[in-house]
Amino acid sequence: APYWTRPERMDKKLLAVPAANTVRFRCPAAGNPTPSISWLKNGREFRGEHRIGGIKLRHQQWSLVMESVVPSDRGNYTCVVENKFGSIRQTYTLDVLERAPHRPILQAGLPANQTAVLGSDVEFHCKVYSDAQPHIQWLKHVEVNGSKVGPDGTPYVTVLKSWISESVEADVRLRLANVSERDGGEYLCRATNFIGVAEKAFWLSVHGPR
């Protein structure tokens, strides 16, 4: 029977895309015999003549491309992959954003500075609002060879967590377990979309038990 070759990358079911941009849906698959792929929009066969500007189907790439998307492109897009031994399907939802998007907004006051006891667990919250898919990162300022900044003046940071959020409103958390003095320092919650960047710095202080 057919199977997905990149199932771990197919968990993003919603694409929120500003109008005029290009969208590509992909369902990379394999099987023996080599399966075929077809596409549905809102449960019905989807062909190029169904949209102004047409579509690009790349069977070898398991992909459907729509250039210059408009609000009428909103809907559920399903790939159906089948051979004589069975079929599998995946549905993506496309939302086309008509309003011009803004850079991400971080809720004021979050994340808050915290003081923690050695060996305790700490959790930071960051609330991100973005009408275009944001790339969210938790970062920590670090020193390299005793310096906090590189030769070009850019601060040295290490990426603790990084992912692309699917929701317009994301309540994200950074959990640090069994903190040591090394965990103390300055951190960042950073959210980026194609318009710009928003970030908030915060501090963790770690001290011994009183």
Partner: antibody, heavy 126, light 109 residues
């Protein structure tokens, strides 16, 4: 027809500033960002920065941070790039380009430049 | 920040196949765009999202991207393909555009 038309060639002295314009036509200006890319004689393409035509947000390559300013005037669908404290190494052709977003269900979002201006030659010489 | 490596030059006889490479650490996890620049002209987008051709770009051009190498292939090379070819990625960590150094294609004869 979608096009970007840039201002004419400039000759500047070291230490001076230059401001290059890029007028867009044939599409909705605020739906796409504008990038600036330069090319020194015989060299490759070097990205300088980009601007959101919607809200004016900017993002610059570290190399040009503090020396370049990119702005837009939505009333005339024009983007501008100003480079200050010019040196001889800034002699190059400067291009503006429309930034298009590509959203992929597996790889996320990526940006490229689908329409380019004709280029503006800036010569820095004493 | 991503670093993209391209061989500086490539020579191909007419009618043969030109293969441009763009090397980068785990570049297969990113999407790559390709531009062609003819002498004295502005760059032109010839491939986006690794494999997609903009309208007006001939089917002789194709792309792929796996592991540490992205590839642009031109079959049945013609004299008019002579140009510089640049790969480009979007570095989502810094929100910066990154170009490869470019490859100059010379069509022999």
């Amino acid at each position: 027809e979608v096009q970007l038309v840039q201002s004419g060639a400039e000759v500047k002295k070291p230490g001076a500033s230059v401001k290059v314009s890029c007028k867009a036509s044939g599409y909705m200006f605020t739906s796409y960002g504008i990038s600036w890319v330069r090319q020194a004689p015989g060299q490759g393409l070097e990205w300088m920065g980009w601007v959101s035509t919607y809200n004016g947000d900017t993002n610059y390559a570290q190399k040009f941070q503090g020396r370049v300013t990119v702005t837009t005037d939505t009333s005339t669908s024009t983007a501008y790039m100003e480079l200050r404290s010019l040196r001889s190494e800034d002699t190059a052709v400067y291009y503006c380009a429309r930034v298009l977003g590509y959203y992929d269900s597996i790889d996320g979002y990526y940006y490229g430049m689908d329409v380019w201006g004709q280029g503006t030659t800036v010569t820095v010489s004493s | 920040q991503s670093v993209l490596t391209q061989p500086p030059s490539l020579s191909v006889a007419p009618g043969k196949t030109a293969t441009f490479t763009c090397g980068g650490n785990n570049i297969g996890d990113k999407s790559v765009h390709w531009y062609r620049q003819k002498p004295g002209q502005a760059p032109v987008l010839v491939m986006y999202l690794d494999t997609e051709r903009p309208s007006g770009i001939p089917e002789r051009m194709s792309g792929s991207n796996f592991g540490n190498t992205a590839t642009l292939t031109i079959t049945r090379v013609e004299a008019e393909d002579e140009a510089d070819y640049y790969c480009q990625v979007w570095d989502s960590g810094s929100d910066h555009v990154v170009f490869g150094g470019g490859t100059k294609l010379t069509v022999l004869g």
